[in-house]
């Protein structure tokens, strides 16, 4: 007996071939001997089966001695043995219909779990293997679970169902809802405008929800809400914003915040959360602000940084085109009695400059100029 695997909702063609390459009488029945369809001359005739409106054949193939049964919009309960009677012969085809669905929405938040459930006909014993977009393989029986979804899990999951040495492939598109970056750092000189961007790692036609940016300034004892906003069909509207600092927010995606001035009291780290409509849980992105200030007071040239810097970062003071006068893994460095010229304060990581501030030291009879 020939075995054919089908997918729920799909269309399947069960073949039946006669030795004569011409149109002759045929009919298809199910295991209960109920007629599904057949022919009367060139006309297609249908029986009283439950497949009536979903069963078809191809007239143009009959002349080739092929008498297919085509079943559209397959259901699990269509799994059966189908019998083709032609030329006093009987051809049996066993159809097994499977369905594979994500038992939650296919749009999931980063960190959530994905469960895939296999629907199968009674008496079958299929095995399932799924391959994620990043090449990770998972195996299972009736259900497969993946916990802690990551951004790289977004895309097409390819699942293969094996039964009777035959296989059928399912493709399920999974969208992991997350920000493109889990964390970002912005380095700014004091007084510069700060731009924070929070690009999403997914695109959906309609995006609705609400969000908030909480900020923990390095100098503050507790965190504070800087801004709250609503998102409706990808349009951003500010609900509430603090007076200090007075953040501005872009009206379109990607989420974009502007801080008019980088000041030491704003240096610190923030957490932007986004709650999406009809989703449990929130999307998070951490953002950090590091602010640099170079000053000269009397005979002391000082360079300071505020905000979350890693211990391996190097802070240096150097006269332009000369070796660093002072270089330390600290958040403040200074030079006493600096010689006149353009001094550079550099914050660097393994030789790569992250932030630079220049200050002009004038001969001792003048006051310093900050460019």
């Amino acid at each position: 007996k020939k075995v054919v695997l089908g997918k729920k909702g799909d269309t399947v063609e069960l073949t039946c071939t006669a030795s004569q390459k011409k149109s002759i009488q045929f009919h298809w029945k199910n295991s209960n001997q109920i007629k599904i369809l057949g022919n009367q001359g060139s006309f297609l005739t249908k029986g009283p089966s439950k497949l009536n409106d979903r069963a078809d054949s191809r007239r143009s193939l009959w002349d080739q001695g092929n008498f297919p049964l085509i079943i559209k919009n397959l259901k699990i309960e269509d799994s059966d043995t189908y019998i083709c009677e032609v030329e006093d012969q009987k051809e049996e085809v066993q159809l097994l219909v499977f369905g594979l669905t994500a038992n939650s929405d296919t749009h999931l938040l980063q960190g959530q779990s994905l469960t895939l459930t296999l629907e199968s006909p009674p008496g079958s014993s299929p095995s399932v293997q799924c391959r994620s977009p990043r090449g990770k393989n998972i195996q299972g029986g009736k259900t497969l679970s993946v916990s802690q979804l990551e951004l790289q899990d977004s895309g097409t999951w390819t699942c293969t169902v094996l039964q009777n040495q035959k296989k059928v492939e399912f493709k399920i598109d999974i969208v992991v809802l997350a920000f493109q970056k889990a964390s970002s750092i912005v380095y700014k000189k004091e007084g510069e405008q700060v731009e924070f961007s929070f690009p999403l790692a997914f695109t959906v036609e309609k995006l609705t929800g609400s969000g908030e940016l909480w900020w923990q300034a390095e100098r503050a004892s507790s965190s504070k809400s800087w801004i709250t906003f609503d998102l409706k069909n990808k349009e951003v509207s500010v609900k509430r914003v603090t007076q200090d600092p007075k953040l501005q927010m872009g009206k379109k995606l990607p989420l974009h915040l502007t801080l008019p001035q980088a000041l030491p009291q704003y240096a610190g780290s923030g957490n932007l959360t986004l709650a999406l409509e009809a989703k449990t849980g929130k999307l998070h992105q951490e953002v950090n602000l590091v602010v640099m200030r170079a000053t000269q007071l009397q005979k002391n040239l000082t360079c300071e940084v505020w905000g979350p810097t890693s211990p391996k970062l190097m802070l240096s003071l150097k006269l332009e085109n000369k070796e660093a006068k002072v270089s330390k893994r600290e958040k403040a460095v200074w030079v006493l009695n600096p010689e006149a010229g353009m001094w550079q304060c550099l914050l660097s990581d393994s030789g790569q400059v992250l932030l630079e501030s220049n200050i002009k030291v004038l001969p001792t009879w003048s006051t310093p100029v900050q460019p």
């Epitope: 269309t11 078809d56 191809r58 007239r59 143009s60 085509i70």
Partner: antibody
Framework: QVQLQQWGAGLLKPSETLSLTCAVS????????WSWIRQPPGKGLEWIGE???????NCNPSLKSRVTISVDTSNNQFSLKLSSVTAADTAVYYC?????????WGQGTLVTVSS | DIQMTQSPSSVSASVGDRVTITCRAS??????LAWYQQKPGKAPELLIY???SLQSGVPSRFSGSGSGTDFTLTISSLQPEDFATYFC?????????FGGGTKVESK
């Protein structure tokens, strides 16, 4: 919703080979036949041929010697190659889904054969 | 090959008119016939299949009849969007063939 998206070269010289591909999305690929049909400017429709997911083909005898239809089931795509083209092959070429009738069509590709 | 002959090749009509297009098959094709509508620059669209079955989403003013060799497409009350070219197609045997088309234009 079933969609057929087709592409391929639009301008050919006589004796060259026409090559078109059609990608199917949003529906069953395995249970249907996938056809190519052409329509010369201002004229009627001519069925070129068809293929199913297992690679079984049927072609119009008038074109059979020059036609190759192939299928790529992993990407739900099928292709047409028509060799040794002449000006008479200038037409809009359509891909379509068929059982007995053509219920979904591609957008069409105008192929012009000119020296 | 099965020959499909459509008539008339063109018809002039006004909105609200009843329009009838015929298709003759040679030889007999039972009821393996479809009707398509095509607008300029667009792909054809299936209207009627199996001679008289209305394709999903097609307005009920379109109807098909006939069996064997003679078939008819009727538009009961012509609408502005119905000005187009109509083709019949047989699915009885390979090669699948189409009629030459009937252009319905505004009077």
């Amino acid at each position: 919703q079933v969609q057929l998206q087709q592409w391929g070269a639009g301008l050919l010289k006589p004796s060259e080979t026409l090559s078109l591909t059609c990608a199917v999305s949003g529906g069953s690929f395995s249970g249907y036949y996938w056809s190519w049909i052409r329509q010369p400017p201002g004229k009627g429709l001519e069925w070129i041929g068809e293929i199913n997911h297992s690679g079984s083909t049927n072609c119009n005898p008038s074109l059979k010697s020059r036609v190759t239809i192939s299928v790529d089931t992993s990407n739900n795509q099928f292709s047409l190659k028509l060799s040794s083209v002449t000006a008479a092959d200038t037409a809009v070429y359509y891909c379509a889904r068929v059982l007995n009738y053509f219920d979904y069509w591609g957008q069409g590709t105008l192929v012009t054969v000119s020296s | 090959d099965i020959q499909m002959t459509q008539s008339p090749s063109s018809v002039s009509a006004s909105v609200g008119d009843r329009v009838t297009i015929t298709c003759r098959a040679s030889p007999d094709i039972a009821n393996w016939l479809a009707w398509y509508q095509q607008k300029p620059g667009k792909a054809p669209e299936l209207l009627i299949y199996a001679a008289s079955s209305l394709q999903s989403g097609v307005p009920s003013r379109f109807s098909g009849s006939g069996s064997g060799t003679d078939f008819t497409l009727t538009i009961s009350s012509l609408q502005p969007e119905d000005f187009a070219t109509y083709f019949c197609q047989q699915a009885n045997s390979f090669p699948l063939t189409f009629g030459g088309g009937t252009k319905v234009e505004s009077k």
